[in-house]
């Protein structure tokens, strides 16, 4: 009778036994062992029990020990068990970012592992178990349907393998897989709102601003504002669930025309867009130009207002004839004239929205010198010992000197506060000069003495 | 095919060591117990000892224990005898042989090497 | 020891056969293994496990064991079958032993 030793085991691929072979005669003719494993007998005393090392065990086999005796022949198998565990444990990728409210299909693949018997497969959220099933095929292949939730940010969903030797005296042997990280978002079907000028002037900062509510995370999500090929580079604000992205755009003569705007929201692998249109516009203020900004008095002026070609203008409020982007005035220069204001107002239409833009140029008339009795009285009475202030105003442009003396060397303070004295009395020469000229008058200050009682 | 190589013809003096090799190839050289047996000149087969080259395990014969080493270098393929002192009754033919790999039982030497003489005189 | 017993010499005609004994203690109850050594060559296995033949060993060559005697047997003997040959057994008695008979030179006439 031919007995085997151990007659089960369970060892690691790779792995090495020693198994006993022995019969129950005390000459057995031939004892050994049949298997494809590398075998080393081990060549112990006694001649009925041989023992052999068997190696590099690598799948499940059954050595059969065999002897022959007097009585006849004989066997015993031993039943050699290969555990390893998966060589291959991973999810099936999938995108990162989920939208909320959608069917997400979780697949795990096992390649290899033994015995398959003892072999399952889990599925995970966190450590919280979303199903467990044995491991069958090869690959091996489990999967789950989650519904995307909002409180799934974030989430690792990841695929272990257990090999349960337990029941054969060995241990949990348990492999996890490369964690999948949940993204879950909510991007709005509305698009957002996008505010800006529908007109902006060359050489001009314009203010856009971009917002949309309803999203989550609303930190991750990104916002493109772009005029045409510009990139804008907006400063944006989150609140709870939305955000405002505002940006200030220039513009220079390269971009006049009609230019798209383009605020674009990405979150997860989606993306909202709003477009718009915008007029880049080149509108120079109107040019008001005169024969002289100075002249003299009398002389005649030719105020021109010139504008855009495609402006109308009116010229101190008076409407260009015919309607155009000219206007022009004549007049001959007064006095009155000096200072005087020229204002021409031209208007575009841009886009449907009126632009308007102003232009003044002042006159400036050269007159004079006057001196008159209305700012110049040429007779003034005081009382002996009362407190005056002589007034003499000049007129002119430029404005005159004036200067009161009497006998070529006294002079009359003009506009100073004075205790008329006799010295005041006496008959003054006024003169005013300026480039202009000059001219002069005669003014008399007569002073009443005091009557003694 | 499988074939076992042993080095050539040694002349040595007493007190002198020696180690000569036997090389297999054709085979899993780790996996087969190896013998080496002696020929004195004229006389029969003496077998002197075997050794498992997979661990280095080694069996002598009482009469050789202690007189020779058996080694292995399995990175090699190859096993050794050694002599740490010679003497002039070391003088013979000596073989490599590979115990037998049969499934029904592995007792005999089924390849042999071709021998190497060693003579030992002053 | 266990000790195994081999004539010095058989001697044959061309074509006769040939018979060598092995005398050993209940040899029956082990295994014997046959080598034919020619002269300035190493040894070679011709029988094996009592009678079994090893490929590329002519059918000539034949073995068998019982009680205390194991024999080979070599039919129509050739020139070339003129050889030295040796049984052997293992000894599991108290340790491990390769034991080699005394051998026999077979001399073809």
């Known amino acids: 009778q031919t007995s085997v030793s151990p007659s089960k085991v369970i060892l690691p691929r790779g792995g090495s036994v020693l198994v006993t072979c022995s019969t129950s005669c005390d000459q057995p003719k031939l004892l050994g062992i049949e298997t494809p494993l590398p075998k080393k007998e081990l060549l112990l005393p006694g001649n009925n029990r041989k023992v052999y090392e068997l190696s590099n065990v690598q799948e499940d086999s059954q050595p059969m020990c065999y002897s022959n005796c007097p009585d006849g022949q004989s066997t015993a198998k031993t039943f050699l068990t290969v555990y390893w565990t998966p060589e291959r444990v991973e999810l099936a990728p999938l995108p990162s970012w989920q939208p909320v409210g959608k069917n997400l299909t979780l697949r795990c693949q096992v390649e290899g592992g033994a015995p398959r018997a003892n072999l399952t497969v889990v599925l995970l959220r966190g450590e919280k178990e979303l199903k467990r099933e044995p491991a069958v095929g090869e690959p091996a292949e489990v999967t789950t349907t989650v519904l995307v939730r909002r409180d799934h940010h974030g989430a690792n969903f990841s695929c272990r393998t257990e090999l349960d030797l337990r029941p054969q005296g060995l241990e949990l042997f348990e492999n996890t897989s490369a964690p999948y990280q949940l993204q879950t978002f909510v991007l709005p079907a509305t698009p957002p709102q996008l505010v800006s000028p529908r007109v902006l002037e060359v050489d001009t900062q314009g203010t856009v601003v971009c917002s949309l509510d309803g999203l989550f995370p609303v930190s991750e999500a990104q916002v493109h504002l772009a005029l045409g090929d510009q990139r804008l580079n907006p400063t944006v604000t989150y609140g709870n669930d939305s955000f405002s992205a505002k940006a200030s755009v220039s513009v220079t003569a390269e971009d006049e025309g009609t230019q798209r705007l383009t605020c674009a929201v990405i979150l997860g692998n989606q993306s909202q867009e709003t477009l718009q249109t915008v007029t880049i516009y080149s509108f120079p203020a109107p040019n008001v130009i005169l024969t002289k900004p100075e002249v003299s008095e009398g002389t005649e002026v030719t105020v021109k207002c010139e504008a855009h070609p495609r402006a109308k203008v009116t010229l101190n409020g008076v409407p260009a004839q015919p309607l155009g982007p000219r206007a022009q005035l004549l007049l001959k220069a007064t006095p009155e004239d000096n200072g005087r204001s020229f204002s021409c107002s031209a208007t575009l239409e841009v886009a449907g929205q009126l632009i308007h833009k102003n232009q003044t140029r002042e006159l400036r008339v050269l007159y004079g010198p006057r001196l008159d009795e209305r700012d110049c009285p040429g007779n003034w009475t005081w009382p002996e010992n009362s407190q005056q202030t002589p007034m003499c105003q000049a007129w002119g442009n430029p404005l005159p000197e004036l200067k009161c003396l009497k006998d070529g060397t006294f002079p009359l303070p003009i506009g100073e506060s004075v205790t008329v004295t006799r010295d005041l009395e006496g008959t003054y020469l006024c003169r005013a000069r300026s480039t202009q000229g000059e001219v002069t008058r005669k003014v008399t200050v007569n002073v009443l003495s005091p009557r003694y009682e | 095919q499988v074939q076992l190589v042993q080095s050539g013809a040694e002349v040595k003096k007493p007190g002198e060591s020696l180690r000569i090799s036997c090389k297999g190839s054709?085979?899993?050289?780790?996996?087969?117990?190896i013998g080496w047996v002696r020929q004195m000149p004229g006389k029969g087969l003496e077998w002197m000892g075997i050794?498992?080259?997979?661990?280095?395990?080694?069996r002598y014969s009482p009469s050789f224990q202690g007189q020779v080493t058996i080694a292995a270098d399995k990175s090699i393929s190859t096993a050794y005898l050694q002599w740490s002192s010679l003497m002039a009754s070391d003088t013979a033919m000596y073989y490599c042989?590979?115990?037998?790999?049969?499934?029904?039982?592995?007792?005999?030497?089924?390849?042999w090497g071709q021998g190497t003489t060693v003579t030992v005189s002053s | 020891s266990y000790e195994l017993t081999q004539p010095p010499s058989v001697s044959v005609a061309p074509g006769k056969t040939a018979t060598i004994t092995c005398g050993g203690d209940?040899?029956?109850?082990?295994?014997v293994h046959w080598y034919q050594q020619r002269p300035g060559q190493a040894p070679v296995l011709v029988i094996n496990y009592d009678s079994d033949r090893p490929s590329g060993i002519p059918e000539r060559f034949s073995g068998s064991n019982s009680g205390n005697t194991a024999t080979l047997t070599i039919s129509r003997v050739e020139a070339g079958d003129e050889a030295d040959y040796y049984c052997?057994?293992?000894?599991?008695?108290?340790?491990?032993?390769?034991?080699f008979g005394g051998g026999t030179k077979l001399t073809v006439l």
């Open positions: 054709g085979y899993s050289f780790t996996n087969y117990w």
């Open positions: 050794i498992y080259p997979g661990d280095s395990d080694t």
């Open positions: 052997q057994v293992e000894d599991r008695r108290g340790g491990y032993h390769v034991v």
């Open positions: 209940n040899i029956g109850s082990k295994s």
């Open positions: 042989a590979r115990r037998g790999s049969r499934s029904s039982g592995e007792d005999a030497f089924e390849v």
